[in-house]
């Protein structure tokens, strides 16, 4: 009946509703149907959220913070539904809401505890700083404070730096990990316990490839089945690192099945894509193609990073000409 939020029943006419920042929610309240219905929703027993009586809304003394954000299910009031539809919740809306319902038969009071969570999709970034390599798991906006765990080759890592900045209504978090000289695979998990939402970033370095000039190279990129769900929207980006910054070679959007290619020598196999294999070919290699190639498969629930190091060496012909 209430599709926009999930709630847990707890004793004493009190329910917990969990909403997401900027989304709409429903604060549930029901009563035994009767005539002369009066409904008053209040926040923290002080602020007027919504009032309805004598067959219509009375919002003259509604607290300004709720203006144009609340409504009732008017066609269902006579059936005993006093639930409040609440638009665009913010973290400031967290707290206890009381629904007073009076009818010709009885008066009932229901309490609803609203908790609001934030979880803007995190990202896993691979960065070079001078001679050091870093993996950074970051989330721009999250509430409450998340749990961040790192694993190296599936073994938890205890050292876990967390750079945190708190704004008025959420946290911004960076968790960097120095992976200089490592060939291990890494996994970072960020969990929002309130929203019961988990995001995972996984980083894998493939063995280096040595190629001759003018040859082509095939670089593999296949999602790990544990994370990958083909029904979920995702994006695949291939990029190349040059002098510390990545330039995008191509990307693919699963929602539109669009492929955009920025490098004419880059090719993707459509049939392989249909089988969720995002391996790519780079034709006619030249010396400047040496470097790190990054495949990034990202959805709301995961980021899978695969790094290939390619060394392009001069061909015998080129060497003898010199």
């Amino acid at each position: 009946i209430f599709p926009l939020a999930f709630f847990i029943y707890v004793p004493m006419n009190e329910q917990i509703v969990i909403g997401r920042l900027d989304e709409d929610i429903i604060l549930p309240s029901s009563f035994e149907r009767g005539s002369e219905v009066v409904i008053h929703w209040k926040y923290q027993d002080s602020y007027k959220v919504h009032s309805y009586y004598k067959g219509s809304d009375h919002l003259e003394s509604q607290d300004p913070r709720y203006a144009n954000r609340t409504s009732l299910f008017y066609n269902e009031i006579q059936n005993g539904n006093a639930s409040l539809f609440f638009r665009r919740v913010s973290l400031l809306d967290e707290g206890i809401y009381t629904c007073y319902v009076g009818t010709a038969i009885q008066v009932i009071t229901n309490k609803v505890v609203l908790k609001v969570g934030v979880f803007l999709t995190p990202v896993m970034k691979y960065e070079k700083r001078n001679t050091n390599s870093f993996l950074i798991c970051s989330v721009l906006s999250v509430y409450p404070r998340p749990i961040i765990t790192w694993k190296m080759d599936n073994t938890p890592i205890s050292e876990n730096n967390m750079e945190e900045t708190g704004s008025l209504d959420s946290f911004s978090i960076n968790s960097p990990l120095n992976i200089t000289g490592s060939n291990s695979s890494y996994e970072c998990t960020i969990e929002n316990s309130l929203l019961k939402q988990t995001w995972t970033g996984r980083w894998t370095m493939k063995d280096g490839l040595h190629k001759m000039q003018s040859e082509h190279v095939s670089l593999s990129c296949q999602p790990v089945n544990d994370y990958f769900s083909p029904n979920q929207d995702f994006k695949v980006t291939w990029s190349r690192m040059k002098s510390g910054t990545f330039s995008v070679l191509a990307y693919y959007l699963s929602s539109s099945q669009n492929t955009i290619i920025n490098e004419s020598r880059f090719s993707w196999n459509k049939e392989l894509i249909n089988q969720s294999d995002f391996s790519m070919n780079l034709m006619d290699l030249n010396l400047s193609d040496s470097g790190e190639y990054l495949c990034n498969i990202s959805s709301d629930e995961y980021t899978l990073l695969t790094i290939h190091t390619v060394h392009v060496e001069p061909s015998q012909e080129t060497a003898s000409h010199n």
Epitope: Y53, K54, V107
Partner: antibody, heavy 121, light 107 residues
Framework: QVQLVESGGGVVQPGRSLRLSCAAS????????IHWVRQAPGKGLEWVAV????????YYADSVRGRFTISRDNSKNTLSLQMNSLRVEDTAVYYC??????????????WGQGTLVTVSS | DIQMTQSPSTLSASVGDRVTITCRAS??????LAWYQQKPGKAPKLLIY???SLESGVPSRFSGSGSGTEFTLTISSLQPDDLATYYC?????????FGQGTKLEIK
């Protein structure tokens, strides 16, 4: 059963003050709005004021606004009407009456027996 | 304020008669009208709310009708116990106002 008992009436000189009380029982006091309604001797009924269930909303008839103050103590199940600057025309039997619910409906389901206020010099 | 006008001011009827009292509002009050009965020396008693809804415990010989500005209270078969003054009251808007009352006498 629902009971409302008014007290505090009496004879008072014009310009003076009087405080009426209403003791409630037989229902959850904090769930209901309570009104004061008065009736001058041999005359009709006149609504005076209402206070909503939690005490935050108070409304008054034009004839008493600024002179009378309605209040309630939900922990003691009592309602009060502080009457200042009394006038001869305030002479009446004062009834406290319970609203259908919060106070928002505005009609009177249960009534007390009334207390007489006489303003006379 | 909304003015409420009752008619007649006094009404004399016999036991068993059908009695009708009228109440007029100076502006539309939808159906937000109540009727009360007040016996001599007693507090008023609610009979009808929302123009036509019978309050619990009130005998079914009492009924109400009307909406907007014209309302009636009907006693289908007058009983000796109905000797009283009857008031209409609008609760559409503050300030709530009563009619001046209709005194019902038994012949």
């Amino acid at each position: 059963q629902v009971q409302l008992v008014e007290s505090g009436g009496g004879v008072v000189q014009p310009g003076r003050s009087l405080r009426l009380s209403c003791a409630a029982s037989g229902f959850t006091f904090s769930d209901y709005g309570i009104h004061w309604v008065r009736q001058a001797p041999g005359k009709g009924l006149e609504w005076v004021a209402v206070i909503w269930y939690e005490g935050s909303d108070k409304y008054y008839a034009d004839s008493v606004r600024g002179r009378f103050t309605i209040s309630r103590d939900n922990s003691k199940n009592t309602l009060s009407l502080q009457m200042n600057s009394l006038r001869v025309e305030d002479t009446a039997v004062y009834y406290c009456a319970r609203d259908r619910s919060s106070g928002a409906m505005g009609y009177f389901v249960y009534w007390g027996q009334g207390t007489l206020v006489t303003v006379s010099s | 304020d909304i003015q409420m006008t009752q008619s007649p001011s006094t009404l004399s009827a016999s036991v068993g008669d059908r009695v009708t009292i009228t109440c007029r509002a100076s502006q539309s009050i939808s159906s937000w009208l109540a009727w009360y009965q007040q016996k001599p020396g007693k507090a008023p008693k609610l009979l009808i709310y929302k123009a036509s809804s019978l309050e619990s415990g009130v005998p079914s010989r009492f009924s109400g009708s009307g909406s907007g500005t014209e309302f009636t209270l009907t006693i289908s078969s007058l009983q000796p116990d109905d000797l009283a003054t009857y008031y209409c009251q609008q609760y559409n808007a503050y300030s709530y106002t009563f009619g001046q009352g209709t005194k019902l006498e038994i012949k």
